[in-house]
Structures are given as structure tokens and as C-alpha cells.
């Protein structure tokens, strides 16, 4: 059986980022995103 291994030679770090909804609209509360490799993806 073939074994597939991802080895790019570097780690991809991720970090949770929290923004206030008020800063981008009229809603209240927090917006949570995920930054992976320097890009916010969610």
C-alpha cells in the first residue's frame, strides 16, 4: 500500500482572530475568523 505524507518543509501556523461586528456593520457581538499562513480563511 502506498503511504502519502505531506512534508512541505515548513509548518503552517494558524491563529484565531476575533473582530467586533460593530466595526464592519450595525450588528453587535464578535466575529471569529481563522488565519492560516497569514490569510484569514473563515
Amino acid at each position: 500500500d502506498a503511504e502519502f505524507r505531506h512534508d512541505s518543509g515548513y509548518e503552517v501556523h494558524h491563529q484565531k482572530l476575533v473582530f467586533f461586528a460593530e466595526d464592519v456593520g450595525s450588528n453587535k457581538g464578535a466575529i471569529i475568523g481563522l488565519m492560516v499562513g497569514g490569510v484569514v480563511i473563515a
Partner: nanobody, 124 residues
Framework: EVQLLESGGGLVQPGGSLRLSCAAS????????MGWFRQAPGKGREFVAA????????YYADSVKGRFTISRDNAKNALYLQMNSLRPEDTAIYYC?????????????????WGQGTLVTVSS
């Protein structure tokens, strides 16, 4: 940019309460989301809580949720952190910070103004 000055720290027994204050100078206080961070001996500065420019929205680190309450008074240019049910692991220097709108409020790099910190020690 605003200048910030914390107060209210001290020695408290486990299970006790403290209220931290942060006084801001400058007329632009309500342009900033405000946050509290803390730094325990030998550790990095970690996010505690933040409040939006209007004071309507708040966000807390999981470790303090349900025990700490952040609030602000824009008329007095003041930020507060009510800390209840304190634990020994809450021992740290507490810093208030100001972050521009639209920046992530849970990361240190978003904050461009800091106070000098106030020491909170939780010990019996």
C-alpha cells in the same frame, strides 16, 4: 494615540474580587476598541477581555469567562475590569490597551497604546 494608566491591582485571597481601572487621556478614547491583557511571571502577554468602542459588545478569554466583566465609560474616558472568583493562576501584571477599529481584538499586535500595568497577586 491615547495615553493609558492602570490602577486597582493588589493582593487578594483566592475567591476574592478586585476591580481594575484604566484611565485614558485624549479626546479619541471612543475611537478605540479597548482590551485587557495580562502577563504572568516568565510567560507572554495573553488576552483577557475586550470591549467595543460603544461598550455594547464584549469578548472574553475562555479562562476568565463568567468570572471577569469588562466595561467602559466613554464620558469618563475609563475602562474597567471587574474580577471575581479570583484564582492563583490569575496572578499577573494586567495591562489595558487600545486597538483601532477593524483590527483583531484578541491579539497583541492590534494594540498600539499600552499602560504601564498593575500587579494582581492572588494568594492566601
Amino acid at each position: 494615540e491615547v495615553q493609558l494608566l492602570e490602577s486597582g491591582g493588589g493582593l487578594v485571597q483566592p475567591g476574592g474580587s478586585l476591580r481594575l481601572s484604566c484611565a485614558a487621556s485624549g479626546r479619541t478614547f471612543n475611537n478605540y476598541n479597548m482590551g485587557w491583557f495580562r502577563q504572568a511571571p516568565g510567560k507572554g502577554r495573553e488576552f483577557v477581555a475586550a470591549v467595543s468602542r460603544s461598550g455594547v459588545s464584549t469578548y472574553y478569554a475562555d479562562s476568565v469567562k463568567g468570572r471577569f466583566t469588562i466595561s467602559r465609560d466613554n464620558a469618563k474616558n475609563a475602562l474597567y475590569l471587574q474580577m471575581n472568583s479570583l484564582r492563583p493562576e490569575d496572578t499577573a501584571i494586567y495591562y489595558c490597551g487600545a486597538a483601532y477599529r477593524g483590527t483583531a481584538i484578541n491579539v497583541r499586535r492590534s494594540y498600539d497604546s499600552w499602560g504601564q500595568g498593575t500587579l494582581v497577586t492572588v494568594s492566601s
